[in-house]
Amino acid sequence: GIAIPRNSGCPNSEDKNFPRTVMVNLNIHNRNTSTNPKRSSDYYNRSTSPWNLHRNEDPERYPSVIWEAKCRHLGCVKADGNVDYHMNSVPIQQEILVLRREPRHCPNSFRLEKILVSVGCTCVTPIVHHVA
Amino acid sequence: GIAIPRNSGCPNSEDKNFPRTVMVNLNIHNRNTSTNPKRSSDYYNRSTSPWNLHRNEDPERYPSVIWEAKCRHLGCVKADGNVDYHMNSVPIQQEILVLRREPRHCPNSFRLEKILVSVGCTCVTPIVHHVA
C-alpha cells in the first residue's frame, strides 16, 4: 500500500495489529445503481459468445451473492444461428475484492480476499497448435 | 446481510457503531495468482471486439490501481480484419467493491464503496429501432 502521513483526526491503529487490521464502514457508498446483472443488460443473450449467469452464494462472504458467467458454447454464434468453431467463446475474468468472515460466523470481523470471477464472454480467434 | 448468531470468540462491536463498522484484516488471502490483466491473457487483442486497458489510479482507494477496458471499435472485427458495423462492440461491466479512505488520507479507516468497471468487450447483435 501507499504510505500516507498520519492525520490527527484519524482513528488510531497500532503496529501490533499487523497483519494490518483497519476499520471499515459497511454503509456502502454506491457510485452507480446496483442491479442484478441479468437485468442490467441483455448482452449475455445478444453476444456472439453468449453466456449464462450462475448464482454463487456464500453467507460467510460479503457480498454473499456473486454472479458467475459460463460461456454457452466453445465456438461463437454466427448470424444464421450456427455455432462457428473457427472462433472460440472464452470467459473474461476479473479479480475482485470480497470480505470473508474471519473467524467464521463472526458478524464484525473480516479478512480481505481476492477471488477470480467470470464476468461475461468474448469471441476470440483460436491459437491452433498442429502436431508435427 | 444475513443475520449470524454471535460467536463468543468474535471481536465486540456495539450497536452505537451503526452505520456498521467492522474490523477488516488487510492481509489479503488470494484464491488465485494475481496478475496484471494485460499478461493474464491476450483476449483483449484476439477478440472480435478488442479493447484497450487503461490504468485508473487513486491513492485514496484500495486497490489504488484498477484497469478499465475501453472497446477499440464501435463495430466488431471480421476474419479479414475489417470492422463490421452491423455488429456492435460493447463493454461488459462489473460492479466491484473497493475501500475508500474516510476520512480522507487516513491509513486505517475506510468506507466500502461500489464502483462500476468495464472488464472487457463483447460483440453483440444491435437492437435496431425502426421508425414507423
Partner: antibody
Framework: QVQLKESGPALVAPSQSLSFTCTIS????????VHWVRQPPGKGLEWLVV???????TYNSALKSRLSISKDNSKSQVFLKMNSLQTDDTAMYYC????????????WGQGTSVTVSS | DVVMTQTPLSLPVSLGDQASISCRSS???????????LHWYLQRPGQSPKLLIY???NRFSGVPDRFSGSGSGTDFTLKISRVEAEDLGLYFC?????????FGAGTKLELN
Amino acid sequence: QVQLKESGPALVAPSQSLSFTCTISGFSLSSYGVHWVRQPPGKGLEWLVVIWSDGTTTYNSALKSRLSISKDNSKSQVFLKMNSLQTDDTAMYYCARDGYYIYTMDYWGQGTSVTVSS
Amino acid sequence: DVVMTQTPLSLPVSLGDQASISCRSSQSLVHSNGNTYLHWYLQRPGQSPKLLIYKVSNRFSGVPDRFSGSGSGTDFTLKISRVEAEDLGLYFCSQGTHAPLTFGAGTKLELN
C-alpha cells in the same frame, strides 16, 4: 431419471429422406443440448449435429447440406431430417444429451436402426 | 477435422489385469478457455455408448474408481486398474474442442 428415446423408420429407399424424433424425459431442452450420432454396422461413431439449449446449432460440415435439426421444448422432442439417403447411411442412429455445453454426451438413447436399401 | 488415433485397436486381457488405452489427436485439444475437451466412452456389446471420463480425467457419476484418465495437449491415456467382466466392450475417445466433434476408431477390450 434422464432418458432419451429415438424413433424413425427402419427401412428407407435410396435417395429418399428420413425423419427421426428424439423424445426426452428427466431434463429440459431449454437447459441442455442434444446431439445426434450414428454408427454403421461393426464400425465406429460419427457425430452428426447438435442443437443447443438456446436453439443455436452446430453441424458436421461434411453432412450439413443433407441435415436439418429442430426441436420443440414444450413437447420435449428433438427432430432430425436427413435428405438424399444412400446405402452408406445404413447405421444405428443415437440421440444423446450434452453434459453442459462441453461436447460431453452424458446420457444416450438406445438407438434406432436404419437400413437404406431398395 | 481433428483425427483421433487410438491404440491398440484390440486389447486382450485377463480379469484382474491392468489395461491401458492410448488416444492421440492430430492437433492440440486445449481450447482457448484453457480446458481440454477429451472424453472417453464405453460401448458394451449390444448397448449404446456410456460416458466414462470427461475433460481428460474426471470420472462421470457412477463410474468406478478403477477407471482413470490422464494426458494433455495431444496425448491421452485411459487406464483400468483391475479389469472386471463388465468392463469388456468397445472404448472410444472423443474430442469436442474443435468442430466437428470426432471419435477414435475404438479399442476392443476382450478376454484372452
